[in-house]
Amino acid sequence: TQNKALPENIKYGIVLDAGSSHTSLYIYKWPAEKENDTGVVHQVEECRVKGPGISKYVQKVNEIGIYLTDCMERAREVIPRSQHQETPVYLGATAGMRLLRMESEELADRVLDVVERSLSNYPFDFQGARIITGQEEGAYGWITINYLLGKFSQKTRWFSIVPYETNNQETFGALDLGGASTQITFVPQNQTTESPDNALQFRLYGKDYNVYTHSFLCYGKDQALWQKLAKDIQVASNEILRDPCFHPGYKKVVNVSDLYKTPCTKRFEMTLPFQQFEIQGIGNYQQCHQSVLELFNTSYCPYSQCAFNGIFLPPLQGDFGAFSAFYFVMNFLNLTSEKVSQEKVTEMMKKFCSQPWEEIKTSYAGVKEKYLSEYCFSGTYILSLLLQGYHFTADSWEHIHFIGKIQGSDAGWTLGYMLNLTNMIPAEQPLSTPLSHSTYV
């Protein structure tokens, strides 16, 4: 017979990341007979769902089905029809839903129930919707970046697949920033931990990993901003808040009811003599930085070393991949280059925050004003969190790599989540197969 390549048996998987500010659908594919190899799964599509995060649908659950339609239909187009019924679909909700659950378990359950019913209407193998824990979010993010960087592979490559990839098998730490929480996950030098709550043990591809992880709820960039506003309005003499974290000339009216809607501002809540206040930007990085630092309680630490709020943090070790909003914000500010020192980043932030709002709007005409207005705060917050929160220094700054994608796949928890739920990360190193996946007959 003629030498003819057999068609590759490809499998697909779908993960929906139901974040606090929006939902994204990711489609992954991999060769079926190589599913236990490291690095073979890759992302083929990301579809961003139009609208806010699912927690915002608590009063309009009947709209959830329509909200998810476009991206689910996109999945039907991308994935071959013959694969639909065996393609698993997972939805993981993160800190936005954790916060809603804190307010009302019943409301959170109702949202998830409607999400589940909507997703089960599609011709895929729907495997459920759940609120993942902060620990899972951190762990799966760590698995994702190290899987994509080839850190679990026993075969040492002579080439690098990404500029910051080192040939050693030392894993990267993971720094994830969302709208409502932030995660730090890495393998510390010392195997013993002072805080069992922050310790995870994995056996992946025949190797044991003792991992530190923590998720700081309410310390995502959006909730951190709400916290800062709630803290600062306490000491405002009237309904005007002169805010150094917004550009000079920027003005915005905030409803006090919106400010106190989130559980994250409860500690700052007080009876105010007004229903609304106006933010007036003054654009001062240094003052903004000082205001942000007040969100981190560093006065109390029951361990040898803490991050903030009394949470154990071992000494930082190795390289870190900083992704999600760490990347989006720093990329917008053009500060993701390996060559940009921490001092230079601070300098650039000072300059950016001090630019007048009218000038900023002109320079970035294509960017939605809501997002554009918050980059000064977000950039300042990222610097404060990394330097004062996690204790990176000017020297260790160069070990932080701001990552959007690795090999075409987004850095984030979704890939790790799917790899785990589809049992594609074996505990032991798989025996290498003699045939490649293009077999000839």
Epitope: R81, S82, H84, Q85, S120, N121, P123, D125, F126
Partner: antibody, heavy 121, light 107 residues
Framework: EVKLEESGGGLVQPGGSMKLSCVAS????????MNWVRQSPEKGLEWVAE??????????HYAESVKGRFTISRDDSKNNVYLQMNNLRPEDTGIYYC????????????WGAGTTVTVSS | DIVMTQSPAILSVTPGDRVSLSCRAS??????LHWYQQKSHESPRLLIK???QSISGIPSRFSGSGSGSNFTLSINSVEPEDVGVYFC?????????FGAGTKLELR
Amino acid sequence: EVKLEESGGGLVQPGGSMKLSCVASGFTFSKYWMNWVRQSPEKGLEWVAEIRLKSNKYGTHYAESVKGRFTISRDDSKNNVYLQMNNLRPEDTGIYYCTTQLDLYWFFDVWGAGTTVTVSS
Amino acid sequence: DIVMTQSPAILSVTPGDRVSLSCRASQSISDYLHWYQQKSHESPRLLIKYASQSISGIPSRFSGSGSGSNFTLSINSVEPEDVGVYFCQNGHSLPLTFGAGTKLELR
């Protein structure tokens, strides 16, 4: 030979209950979504219910007109699919077909001969 | 729900005629449209899947076309045994819905 055979139809009073059964043969029953479709002169062909696989946690879907009254279930060990019909109404009268899709989904390439349900006082 | 509208309701034909049956969906369903034939006192039988894909065992005179919301079932040269009712079906999303049918009869 691929075959579906329905049973359990008959005459029932409004408000009454009835359970339809369908036995499958000639294919690996546990691997396929199963459906019930009904037909009446008044409403024509009408999809009634679907049940998916064990791996899909036996997920079920129903037409709005039967939701809360009808229950589809399956027994993979017996190659059987069932339709439990409660609180029956005259408009539920018709021929009930057991159907499946051996090739992909949401069309019906295998139909049973049907069983007639009459709801009347 | 997606409403399927078929026309004409009745079609009188002569053997050998080429006929076209129409089906319209109330919203776009891509090519998720299936056609069935039902002869008197029989169960429906699948004729065409996904708007235009033929089914093994179905005579080649039956063909389908269309995409989005407008679809056509064509019978190249009608045979006497083609008499019956033809239904189209939305296979795009739940609830699955059928058209009311087109009755094909001999003139």
